[in-house]
Structure formats: structure tokens, C-alpha cells
């Protein structure tokens, strides 16, 4: 591994702090905050150039002061180089309790995977300790203040700082971002890069050509007066170490959306159609709303077009208030801030048959006492084609007497216009209503016809219905 050739190397190859015998061999230990020093030797004087300890205690005032020796302070090196530095301290043998040296960076203890070694050089006066720290291939994250700490006689001693400044190519903290813009409308792009080293200068590039002849200091805001077509912008960040280029971003011109596609009918009822579609390309501007256009397909003339507006999402709309059993042509168009898309291809859709719109007419009710049945008759209602094919009738009959209430209904087929139902309760009132049924559903009920059912044979007959137009009772 090649190490950066700086004055730092003297910290390893140069003379050690304090007086050590020439033939003295050090012993080493990997860094741990729990390293124990060897037994202290005889006393000696303290070296002159030391960093003042950060903490003092009453007990320690009885002993000569001990502090880390001065070392390199501000290390400047390039990214990916190797660096090594150290802390050293001389502990006289008068100090009985000492713990190992720990390394700290920006206020946090460095534990684990850092390459540090502590070397001990004992002699007759005490022990010299050197804590070596090395970083291979430094990165920006290695920038910061490094300190050594150790406890001597329960007093924490902190070294002077070693500030590691890793210099490299500019590093982007804000790159231009893709934006969609209105044609010929001004917009801004921002680019910010940092060192060290500083300053960082910015050049803007549009479609591979430089925009500004003179660089701007980071951060830089480029105001583009307007574009008529899509362009690609990037920024170059320069410092003394070289150049970094940002990502290229596409600036798109907003246009009207493409027409929706895949218009489908999901469900039809007699009076509504549920339609879905796939939005077309949004034209680089969010779709705001959509318009469903509906026209009757059967009309020979250009019938009026019904327009239903809805939000752009979900891509679904229920068209309501349509005629039953009718054919319609349907298309969809959507808009963004620029304008409306062309309409989608028209598709055909049909509503199903509806329920009858008119109740049966001329309802009469008779009591057949001998058979104990009600005889009910009516006239078939005038059913339109879109109401569908008549399939039968529903007869509702409600029986009421003192303390009793019974609500019943029967369905009868469309053959004929009469029905018989058994008497349920005597000495009661029976209310009869009839509705026509088609495949489209059940129509409205007729006006009620009441009949009083006597205890034995007295009958009060009360027909109550509107005669069909043009018909007379016989």
C-alpha cells in the first residue's frame, strides 16, 4: 500500500517523544479503549511541549502534569490517498492508574474497524505511549476532527485536535432536476456543488454546449428565458482538483395530451352506461379533467351531443339519464393545462330495456263468496318498445282487520288480464295494486282498489282505477 508522502511520515520515522534508549524495542497492541499499560518504571521529568489537559482534579495536583505531546494539527490530502497520524504521551512512573488511548472523531468514539495501533516504550523513568492511526484510501466521510483521550489517575486527558481535510473533485449536493415547461416561458435550474477545496465554479451546459462563458460560484441558478423544443441541461462543477459533471436532465415542452385509448363499456343498464378508458400521453402536464361525449347512434341526422365532464382519475364514468333500449356512440377527450386532447375513437354502446312506465289500467276486484276467492281483472298498459317485452304482473294485496295486518304479493304471467287470489281474512279490508313486469324490471303500481270482505256473504264492491285512454267501462 502506498502512503501519502507528507510531513506526517516523520511522525513514524522521526525521533520518539521523551528520552528512550537507542536499543529499546517497543511492544505494540492493537487499539482498544481497554488497553492496559505495563507496570510503571522510575520517575522522570515531563517534556516541555505538551497539550494542556482538559480536565483537572484535586488529587492530580499532587503529581506532575501529564498531557499529550503536540503533533500535526491540520492535515490536507487528496481523496483516495492514505493517511497516518498519531498521538503520543509520556507517563511518569508516579502515575499508578492508566487506561489505554481511545480515538474520537467529531465527538464520537471510534470503535471497531479503524486501523489503530498503540505502542508502548517503557524505560526507567516511565512509559512513552504512541497511538498510531491510519486510514487507507481516504474518503470525504473521513473529514473531521480527531482527538485522542486517555484516563490517567481517573483524570481524562484530551489531545489537541488533528483535523483531516480530504480534498477531492466537487461533490454535488443539489443537481438540476427535470422539469416540464410551457413553450417560451422562463424557468430556473439550480446546481450546487461543494469541495473541499473551494471555491467550486459552475458552468451550465445545454445540449452539449456551454451556456455561460464565465463560471459562476456554487450555488448557481440558471434562468432559461424559454424553450421551443425539448432540451438536455447539465452543470459542470470545477475546483482545483478537477471537474465533476452532473446528471443530464430533460426539459420537456408541455403540449396537449394525446387522445384516450381503449374506451370500453363495463356495464349497461336501461338508463346508464359505465365507460372506462386508458388516458393518452399527458403531454408533460398532469391531466386535469376528461369529457365523455355521447350521441344517439340511431339518429339519421347529426343529433345533439351530450357532454359529461369528470375528473381525470379514476378513468371511469357512469353516463346516466339515458333512454332505455337505445344505441349510443361514445368518445372521450381529456385536458391538461395546455388544452384538450383530440377525442378517442367512437365506440357503440346500448342501454338495456327498461321497466314499464305505466301501471295496468281499469282494475276491478270481485268477491266470489262461493269459492272464497277474489276475482281481479285489469287492462294491459300501453308499453313502449324501450320498456321491453311484457313478461307478467305483480299483484300486491294487503289485508287489514282489527288487530291483523297481512301484506302479500303474487306474480302472474302475461297471458290474460285476470287473476284469482284466495280470501285471507274475513271481516277485513283488502287493498289491491298491480304493476306490469318486463325484462327491464317492474313498473309502477296502479292506484289502490279496496274491497271489504264481510263476515259471511255481504259484499261491498269498490272498483277504483283510471280507464285506459279511449276505453269505456262496459
Amino acid at each position: 500500500e502506498k502512503w501519502e508522502e507528507t510531513e506526517l511520515d516523520q511522525l513514524f520515522s522521526g525521533p520518539l517523544p521523551g528520552r528512550l534508549p537507542v536499543n529499546h524495542r517497543p511492544f505494540s497492541a492493537p487499539h482498544s479503549s481497554r488497553d492496559q499499560l505495563p507496570p510503571p518504571q522510575t520517575g522522570r521529568s515531563h517534556p516541555a511541549h505538551t497539550a494542556a489537559p482538559q480536565v483537572t482534579s484535586t488529587a492530580s495536583k499532587l503529581l506532575p502534569p501529564v498531557a499529550f505531546n503536540h503533533t500535526i494539527g491540520h492535515i490536507v490530502l487528496s481523496e483516495h490517498k492514505n493517511v497516518k497520524f498519531n498521538c503520543s504521551i509520556n507517563i511518569p512512573n508516579t502515575y499508578q492508574e492508566t487506561a489505554g488511548i481511545s480515538w474520537w472523531k467529531d465527538g464520537k468514539e471510534l470503535l471497531g474497524a479503524h486501523h489503530s495501533i498503540t505502542q508502548f516504550y517503557p524505560d526507567e523513568e516511565g512509559v512513552s505511549i504512541i497511538a498510531l492511526f491510519s486510514i487507507a484510501s481516504v474518503q470525504r466521510s473521513d473529514n473531521g476532527s480527531y482527538f485522542c483521550k486517555m484516563k490517567v489517575n481517573n483524570r481524562e486527558i484530551v489531545s489537541d485536535p488533528i483535523y483531516v481535510e480530504v480534498q477531492g473533485l466537487p461533490y454535488f449536493i443539489k443537481q438540476p432536476e427535470s422539469v416540464n415547461v410551457t413553450r417560451n416561458t422562463a424557468f430556473n435550474l439550480t446546481c450546487q456543488a461543494v469541495g473541499p477545496p473551494e471555491p467550486v465554479n459552475i458552468f451550465w451546459v445545454q445540449n452539449s454546449s456551454r451556456v455561460n462563458e464565465k463560471p459562476e460560484r456554487s450555488p448557481s441558478v440558471l434562468t432559461v428565458p424559454g424553450l421551443t423544443e425539448t432540451a438536455v441541461f447539465s452543470c459542470e462543477a470545477h475546483n482545483d482538483k478537477g471537474l465533476t459533471v452532473s446528471k443530464g436532465v430533460h426539459i420537456n415542452i408541455k403540449v396537449i395530451p394525446s387522445p384516450p385509448t381503449e374506451v370500453h363499456i363495463l356495464n349497461s343498464t336501461a338508463h346508464s352506461i359505465l365507460v372506462s378508458w386508458v388516458p393518452g400521453f399527458d403531454g408533460y402536464s398532469p391531466l386535469q379533467n376528461c369529457s365523455i361525449q355521447v350521441k344517439e347512434a340511431d339518429r339519421l341526422s347529426n343529433g345533439s351531443v351530450m357532454v359529461f365532464n369528470t375528473s381525470a382519475s379514476p378513468h371511469l364514468y357512469e353516463i346516466q339519464q339515458l333512454q332505455a333500449l337505445a344505441n349510443y356512440s361514445i368518445a372521450v377527450s381529456c385536458r391538461n393545462e395546455i388544452g384538450w386532447s383530440a377525442v378517442s375513437p367512437w365506440i357503440l354502446a346500448s342501454t338495456t330495456e327498461g321497466a314499464p312506465s305505466v301501471a295496468p289500467l281499469n282494475i276491478t276486484v270481485f268477491l266470489n263468496e262461493s269459492n272464497n276467492i277474489l276475482d281481479i281483472r285489469w287492462t294491459k298498459p300501453p308499453i313502449k318498445r324501450q320498456d321491453g317485452e311484457l313478461v307478467g304482473y305483480r299483484i300486491s294485496h294487503v289485508w287489514e282487520s282489527a288487530g291483523t295486518y297481512k301484506e302479500l304479493s303474487e306474480e302472474v304471467s302475461q297471458n290474460g288480464s285476470w287473476a284469482q287470489i284466495p280470501v285471507q281474512i274475513h271481516n277485513a279490508t283488502c287493498t289491491v295494486r298491480i304493476a306490469a313486469i318486463t325484462k327491464g324490471g317492474i313498473g309502477p303500481f296502479s292506484e289502490p282498489v279496496n274491497i271489504i270482505i264481510p263476515e259471511h256473504s255481504k259484499v261491498d264492491y269498490a272498483p277504483s282505477s283510471t280507464p285506459a285512454p279511449g276505453n269505456t267501462d262496459s
Epitope: Q54, H70, H74, D106, S145, D160, Y163, Q192, V194, P196
Partner: antibody, heavy 122, light 111 residues
């Protein structure tokens, strides 16, 4: 990146005065900002600094006489609590050289404002 | 506090010549030292940091050296544009405080 001082004016002794440093393109949560003054025809005099974390440090002579505070994401104030004629000077704000989310560090000054003149006179 | 003593207070030299400015710290500041250039009516501009590292855009005619308590700024091949006042600054710090201080300044006159 730029800095600009404002608030410099003529005041009488004892009248508190607040100067404001407004930054552009500088993230005050990443950089320290310091104040330095220069009396007419004299040298530069360090007053104090506010770190990226908001910790303040003052020169010994300036403690109690000046207060530095971050008032927004783009402004830092220097309050001269009880000015005397000796405080007549051009006051500069300057950005610390290194970005870092720590309370202390090597604070030499990389970018300076043009300065604002404060005159303390009767 | 750390006190920075700068000498000389003023120095004169001819175009093409060399000037040397010295700065002494009252205690060891390792290499936490910066040099600034200031011209009349302008704010200072950093020339050198970490005692010997040239700031961006500064010509290599400016050279810083020293460590501990003794520092030197040397300007060689003097140009008229170098006429200015030069200041040293300690930016030493500890784990609990910072010790910023400027020297008194040296005026460089280029004739």
C-alpha cells in the same frame, strides 16, 4: 455564495446596536459564521463565531459585550450590548471554511462580506 | 487566549523582489494558521491555510511555512498587485473551545 452585513450606523455610547449578516447560497446548518471587526486604520480583530450547531464562541475580550445569534436560516445577528467609542469599526461577517455538523472545528474564514461601518460617538 | 505577534509592521520591496513576514504564536498552535491579504476598502482574502497550503486561485509566488509557534509568509517575484496588508490568523481549537486570533498585520509596499 455571498454575505452582506447591514445595520451599521452612528449611535451614541451605551445604545445597543444589532448588526445582521444575510447569507445567500450558504446553508447555516452546515457552516459556521464568524464576526471580525477592524477599527479605522487598524488591524483585524476576531469577535466570535456561531457554529453550524448554534454553539457560540467569543474572544475573551468580547464576552459579555457581544451576542451572536442565528435569527433565521439566512441571517445571523451580532448585538453590541453597550457600545463605547472604542467599538467604532467596520464589522465583517465571514463564513467558516468547512462544512460540518459539529460544534467546533478549524474556523478560518473563507468568504467575507464587504463590511458595515459602525460609528459610536457622542 | 492565544496572542499572535506579526513582524514587521511594514515592509517595502521592489517589483520582482521578495518579502518575508513572520508570525509568532504565544503557544503552540500546530499548523492551524491562515494568512490573509487585505486591500484598502475590501474585506480580507484567504491566501494560505494549514500554515503552508495555498488557497484556490492564489499564485504559487505566495509560500507559507512553519509549525508550532513560528510561521512565515514569503512573497517572491513581487508584483504591484501584491501591495496590501497581510494578516496571520490562528484557528487553533480544542475539544471544547476555539482560539481564533489575528496578528497585527504587515503592510507591504511595492515600489
Amino acid at each position: 455564495q455571498s454575505l452582506e452585513e447591514s445595520g451599521g450606523r452612528l449611535v451614541t455610547p451605551g445604545t445597543p446596536l444589532t448588526l445582521t449578516c444575510t447569507v445567500s447560497g450558504i446553508d447555516l446548518s452546515s457552516y459556521a459564521l464568524g464576526w471580525v471587526r477592524q477599527a479605522p486604520g487598524k488591524g483585524l480583530e476576531y469577535i466570535g463565531i456561531i457554529s453550524s450547531t448554534g454553539t457560540t464562541y467569543y474572544a475573551t475580550w468580547a464576552k459579555g459585550r457581544f451576542t451572536i445569534s442565528k435569527t433565521s436560516s439566512t441571517t445571523v445577528d451580532l448585538k453590541i450590548t453597550g457600545p463605547t467609542t472604542e467599538d467604532t469599526a467596520t464589522y465583517f461577517c465571514a463564513r467558516g471554511a468547512y462544512a460540518g455538523y459539529v460544534a467546533f472545528g478549524p474556523y478560518y474564514f473563507h468568504i467575507w462580506g464587504p463590511g458595515t461601518l459602525v460609528t459610536i460617538s457622542l | 487566549d492565544i496572542v499572535m505577534t506579526q513582524t514587521p509592521a511594514s515592509v517595502e520591496a521592489a517589483v520582482g523582489g521578495t518579502v518575508t513576514i513572520k508570525c509568532q504564536a504565544s503557544q503552540s498552535i500546530s499548523n492551524f494558521l491562515a494568512w490573509y491579504q487585505q486591500k484598502p476598502g475590501q474585506p480580507p482574502k484567504v491566501l494560505i491555510y494549514a500554515a503552508s497550503h495555498l488557497a484556490s486561485g492564489v499564485p504559487s509566488r505566495f509560500k507559507g511555512s512553519g509549525s508550532g509557534t513560528q510561521f512565515t509568509l514569503t512573497i517572491s517575484d513581487l508584483e504591484c498587485a501584491d501591495a496590501a496588508t497581510y494578516y496571520c490568523q490562528s484557528y487553533f481549537y480544542s475539544s471544547t473551545s476555539i482560539y481564533n486570533a489575528f496578528g497585527g498585520g504587515t503592510e507591504v509596499v511595492v515600489r
